[in-house]
């Protein structure tokens, strides 16, 4: 029998094993976070995989994944949201440290999801696991990139109270507005609910003294958010090394000075 | 003395071109979204497009879009607007205003005065 | 039709207090900054009041107040030189796009 035509995309194909993987996640999840011990995993990868399994991966939308954002409803206690841009590893470390705030991927869908790839075929079950399209190359609208729309819109619209967010001082573009956080989530925080935004600048060189608040692109941040009447604050953080010890051991002497 | 200065204004045919200028004094420009605000004669302010610090998010109101287009020198402390396929209903005084975070629109210039007519 | 509304027009003797309303809703008014602009005759507008505060310089005869989806300009004390017209604005979230009321013209009987 003659294999059947498949759609070559730009983009690498579905992680391998991916149906075991998020099964593996969800289960794990559930099991160290009692208030999801209620969600059933398997009706959580139905879910999942009825949003993309049988879809043309270039026609994905939001509603698609409504379904799964349903099953993996979780709230974030205010003040406790830590969003982040172009650092998404120093933003990890730093909720691994400081248990009580929360990046997307220390929720359970974010955590399903997070450096996975996966896309399906038109009319058919099975998953792609050759090529998936690329989000320049082929189209925006394919699974993984719905995906994070989705779940990131969600997260910054259930924030409240003073939300912070991580950005990467060693990027020409410190707020980029083509980034998740620049597109979707600084347009989806809520006024009546989020008092303010505070943002982190992670710097990158050891002598890099300047003060990366006054960038052009953090002023451009804060023009955006004033005119939703959500507050502004900025901090350098000097010594990211530094930042993430003093969390660990904030009682160290060395400590109470800048970082 | 904080200024904001517009030139550019005149009598166009409908169809025509012109391209608005606003050069800013007295405060850091880069610092301020920027925007084109205009009056017809005798009516209210209608905003007409505005753009940010960096030029990286730029907005127009539905009636200019696709016809109009902001732009912003830094270099020269200048903000541009260009208008292509004017109409009759684009005759206004077009006020330049900066943006001031958590402000509003808190200069604004002394306008420049565009009409079209046959 | 503007998307903010306001009355065409309001009046008042010298001394009184007269308010002046603002109506929009929640993707403008309610949960976005507001302003009030004031332009006397011939002049550019001036900002008046942002966020219910006033610019250095505006006397505080004039108050701006907000509830939910609607917003008020109040001038206490009114004088001949208050006669102008007054326009509220917001930022729209759905529209992407600074919002502009009509514009009330204010007569100083």
């Known amino acids: 029998v003659l294999p059947r035509w498949r759609q070559q995309w730009s983009g690498s194909g579905t992680t391998s094993r991916f149906p075991e993987t998020v099964l593996a996640r969800c289960v794990k999840y559930t099991e160290v976070h009692p208030e999801m011990r209620h969600v059933d995993c398997q009706s959580v990868w139905d879910a999942f995989k009825g949003a993309f399994i049988s879809k043309y991966p270039c026609n994905i939308t939001e509603e698609d994944y409504q379904p799964l954002v349903k099953l993996g409803t979780q709230t974030v206690p205010c003040n406790k949201t830590l969003l982040w841009s172009r650092i998404k590893d120093l933003a990890h470390q730093f909720t691994q440290v400081q248990r009580d705030m929360f990046t997307l991927e220390d929720m359970l869908l974010g955590y399903l999801a997070d450096d996975l790839t996966w896309c399906g075929e038109f009319n058919t079950f099975e998953i792609n696991y050759q090529s998936c399209p690329d989000w320049r190359k082929d189209c925006s609208n394919n699974p993984v990139s719905v995906f994070w729309k989705t779940v990131s819109r969600r997260f910054a619209e259930t924030a409240c109270g003073v939300v912070h967010v991580m950005l990467n001082g060693s990027r020409s573009k410190i707020f980029d507005k083509n980034s998740t956080f620049g597109s979707v989530e600084v347009h989806n925080l809520q006024p009546e609910k989020v008092q303010a935004l505070e943002a982190w600048v992670i710097h990158g060189g050891r002598e890099d003294s300047r003060d990366l608040c006054q960038d052009p692109t953090i002023k451009e941040l804060e023009s955006i958010i004033s005119k939703r009447n959500i507050r502004f604050f900025c901090k350098n953080i000097y010594r990211p090394d530094k930042f993430l010890q003093c969390v660990k051991n904030p009682e160290d002497s060395s400590c109470l000075s800048g970082i | 003395e904080v200024q904001l200065l517009e030139s550019g204004g005149g009598l166009v045919q409908p169809g025509g071109s012109l391209r608005l200028s606003c050069v800013a004094s007295?405060?850091?420009?880069?610092?301020?979204?920027m925007n084109w605000v205009r009056q017809a004669p005798g009516k209210g302010l209608e905003w007409v497009s505005s753009?940010?610090?960096?030029?990286?998010?730029?907005y127009y109101a539905d009636s200019v879009k696709g016809r109009f287009t902001i732009s912003r020198d830094n270099s020269k402390n200048t903000l541009y607007l260009q208008m292509n396929d004017l109409r009759a209903e684009d005759t206004a005084v077009y006020y330049c205003?900066?943006?001031?975070?958590?402000?509003?629109?808190?200069?604004w210039g002394q306008g420049t005065t565009v009409t079209v007519s046959s | 039709q503007s998307v903010l509304t306001q009355p065409p027009s309001a009046s008042g003797t010298p001394g009184q207090r007269v308010t002046i309303s603002c109506s929009g809703s929640?993707?403008?008014?309610?949960?976005?900054?507001v302003n009030w602009y004031q332009q006397l005759p011939g002049t550019a507008p001036k900002l008046l009041i942002y966020?219910?505060q006033r610019p250095s310089g505006v006397p505080d005869r004039f108050s701006g107040s907000k509830s939910g989806t609607s917003a008020s300009l109040a001038i206490s004390g009114l004088q001949s030189e208050d006669e102008a017209d007054y326009y509220c604005?917001?930022?729209?979230?759905?529209?992407?796009?600074?919002?502009f009321g009509g514009g009330t013209k204010l007569t100083v009987l």
């Open positions: 604005a917001a930022w729209d979230d759905s529209l992407n796009a600074w919002v």
């Open positions: 205003a900066n943006y001031k975070s958590y402000h509003g629109m808190d200069v």
């Open positions: 753009i940010s610090i960096t030029g990286n998010y730029i």
């Open positions: 929640s993707s403008n008014i309610k949960n976005n900054l």
């Open positions: 966020n219910n």
């Open positions: 007295g405060f850091t420009f880069t610092n301020y979204e």
